[in-house]
Interface confidence: medium
């Protein structure tokens, strides 16, 4: 019979011959024959392979590096990587996070908008007129000055973006 | 200076409980997000928790919530750590941590070693 030119799905050609593919989490160790099977072996302990391959070898799981500020999310099997993610308070600085970047903590003045993730960056807003923040942040919000006039009290100093107003007691007309 | 001092470690069987205390100077403490940190033998840092500069905002790491306790006493400039239910994994020495700071960290106290053992 004519050798065939192409080969099936999971299939792969060589010597004029089809041989299987090794499966997801195994290694190509030797080709197959006209008498034998491919032979595969499973990967080894921090290694994977994940598709049907005729690799030699088998990938390293990534190293979640902590002097990085990694740290591992999901351990990798013989089939599937290592996905690392960043420690609590950072960010990745792309999406394969290879490194992983501090949460910018919001001024005085600025406001949380939105708290940081594992995969984007801390949002601040400036405080509006009303608002004040006097604290370097990564989680706090704006706050609203107190209102002197539910404490029965009026402005004694103005608030700012930074500050609370201060609130003192009302002047007194004598009789 | 920022100086961190943190105090309240010793040896405690499992199932015990420790407060751990963290005295902060050379710095204006309740304006800045604080969090602790440890290290067990032979093994890399593991962040443990993060309070926000009020208060209001804490995070635990899944190893410990529900067991430990992250507060703060912005008039005493002092962080605490409540542990309770220690279990033989605790054991470490822990570091509290002016937050935001550079990885790897450039500042530490001298830390409080925690043991947990029967």
């Known amino acids: 019979p004519e050798p065939p030119t192409a080969c099936r799905e999971k299939q792969y050609l060589i010597n004029s011959q089809c041989c299987s593919l090794c499966q997801p989490g195994q290694k190509l160790v030797s080709d197959c024959t006209e008498f034998t099977e491919t032979e595969c072996l499973p990967c080894g302990e921090s290694e994977f392979l994940d598709t049907w391959n005729r690799e030699t070898h088998c990938h390293q799981h990534k190293y979640c590096d902590p002097n990085l500020g990694l740290r591992v999310q999901q351990k990798g099997t013989s089939e599937t990587d290592t996905i690392c993610t960043c420690e609590e308070g950072w960010h990745c600085t792309s999406e394969a996070c290879e490194s992983c970047v501090l949460h910018r903590s919001c001024s005085p003045g600025f406001g949380v908008k939105q708290i940081a993730t594992g995969v984007s960056d801390t949002i601040c807003e400036p405080c509006p007129v009303g608002f004040f923040s006097n604290v370097s942040s990564a989680f706090e919000k704006c706050h609203p000055w107190t209102s002197c006039e539910t404490k029965d009290l009026v402005v004694q100093q103005a608030g700012t973006n930074k500050t609370d107003v201060v609130c003192g007691p009302q002047d007194r007309l004598r009789a | 200076e920022v100086q961190l001092l943190e105090s309240g470690g010793g040896l405690v069987q499992p199932g015990g409980s420790l407060r751990l205390s963290c005295a902060a100077s050379g710095f204006t403490f309740g304006i800045y997000d604080m969090k602790w940190v440890r290290q067990a033998p032979g093994k890399g840092l593991e962040w443990v928790s993060t309070i926000s500069s009020s208060g209001t905002h804490t995070y635990y790491a899944d190893s410990v919530k529900g067991r430990f306790t992250i507060s703060r006493d912005n008039s005493k400039n002092t962080l605490y750590l409540q542990m309770n239910s220690l279990r033989a994994e605790d054991t470490a020495v822990y570091y509290c941590?002016?937050?935001?700071?550079?990885?790897?960290?450039?500042?530490w106290g001298q830390g409080t070693l925690v043991t947990v053992s029967s």
């Open positions: 941590a002016k937050y935001p700071q550079p990885y790897p960290f450039d500042y």
